[in-house]
Interface confidence: low
Amino acid sequence: QTSADAIYDCSSLYQKNYRISGVYRLPSNDFLGSPELEVFCDMETKGGGWTVIQRRKSGLVSFYRDWKQYKQGFGSIRGDFWLGNEHIHRLSRQPTRLRVEMEDWEGTVRYAEYSHFVLSNELNSYRLFLGNYSGNAGNDALYYHNNTAFSTKDKDNDNCLDKCAQLRKGGYWYNCCTDSNLNGVYYRLGEHDKHLDGITWYGWHGANYSLKRVEMKIRPEDFKP
């Protein structure tokens, strides 16, 4: 199998004329050291080819998980899930864009996009590196998390005197602690504006507004629909 034929991610599938959004199975790749992986592909948004790495929409899955679970991934690929840091790291080894889509409880949808996205390896604590921000989600609420390591309730890698993962009830690139908390607690309408450990994006709705829906998705920087 040549590199042109290989299927690495949803953009590879798109180029092979798989144009319907949904669940796909990426084959294992011995050269990349990646196992077979079930992914959800967004083949519609802004040209398609996006591999969804996170989704929050139902609140049925707890995101207050440990390091091993965030490494391997958890949840339901059709519902709420985290793809897994090891998988996301492998997917971002080529130059990659990140898109974050969010919806509030009033039904307004906003997005943030980053021209460059890298998740380093486990030895480097899945440190986050981001390029330039664009979008309409207010102030860039991931910039504060750029160049920070991933933390979970059992692995405190943040830049804070506090244990951010335990305080914000998630796994994330905590600094001290958050300008966003996309893996925080899912609060339903009525509770959505009362907590600081919710699914927050400070640049849009501030520190204690937990969003209704969030999706994080990636695709290669050089992707052409």
């Epitope: 102030n139 609420a141 504060y144 405190d156 943040d158 830049n159 804070c160 005197l161 506090d162 244990k163 951010c164 305080l167 914000r168 905590y174 001290c176 602690c177 958050t178 300008d179 600081l196 450990d197 400070y202 640049g203 501030g206 520190a207 204690n208």
Partner: antibody, heavy 120, light 107 residues
Amino acid sequence: EVQLVESGGGLVQPGRSLRLSCAASGFTFDDFAMHWVRQGPGKGLEWVSGIGWNSGSIGYADSVKGRFTISRDNAKNSLYLQMNSLRAEDTALYYCAKAPDYGDYYFDYWGQGTLVTVSS
Amino acid sequence: DIQMTQSPSSLSASVGDRVTITCRASQSISIYLNWYQQKPGTAPKLLIYAASSLQSGVPSRFSGSGSGTDFTLTISSLQPEDFAAYYCQQSYTTPLTFGGGTKVEIK
């Protein structure tokens, strides 16, 4: 009820040492970061140092770095500030302050302070 | 280090007045800005955290706004017990820094 009680202040000569203590009660001490903040006579507030819940993270103001050492004993619910090589400009009321439970560098409870006077 | 500049350094006002104090950061600090009140001979008291969140037990006449570099503390209707010094503080990064303070005095 959260209570923070500082002690150990007093008159000390320049170049000498002093150790401040803060006894905490009314909350689970080892869940929270703690800080020292000082206020010179007739002056504003100045953050001195902070320490994480498990002493894993520690920070200092540039003005005290290398001279002051913050520590805590979670078993005794106590916070300490070892102050060496004291200078006249260290004269201040020293407050012990608790961080909030959402992981941020600010102070939701304060003690009443202990006065340190550095003078020959 | 991030410098915090508070203005005015002092002001005179009457009971019932609307009072506004501003704080400017030397670089963007998102919403990591907090406000404290200090009365003579007592420890500071937290009023507002995260730019606009009211600390539990603080009267609703106190409010905060702003993000980035410019922030405001507003007292909608000054009460006798509000005559005090007010400090802003950035909690974006260490070293933590305070504004120089604003003394609110009786006119």
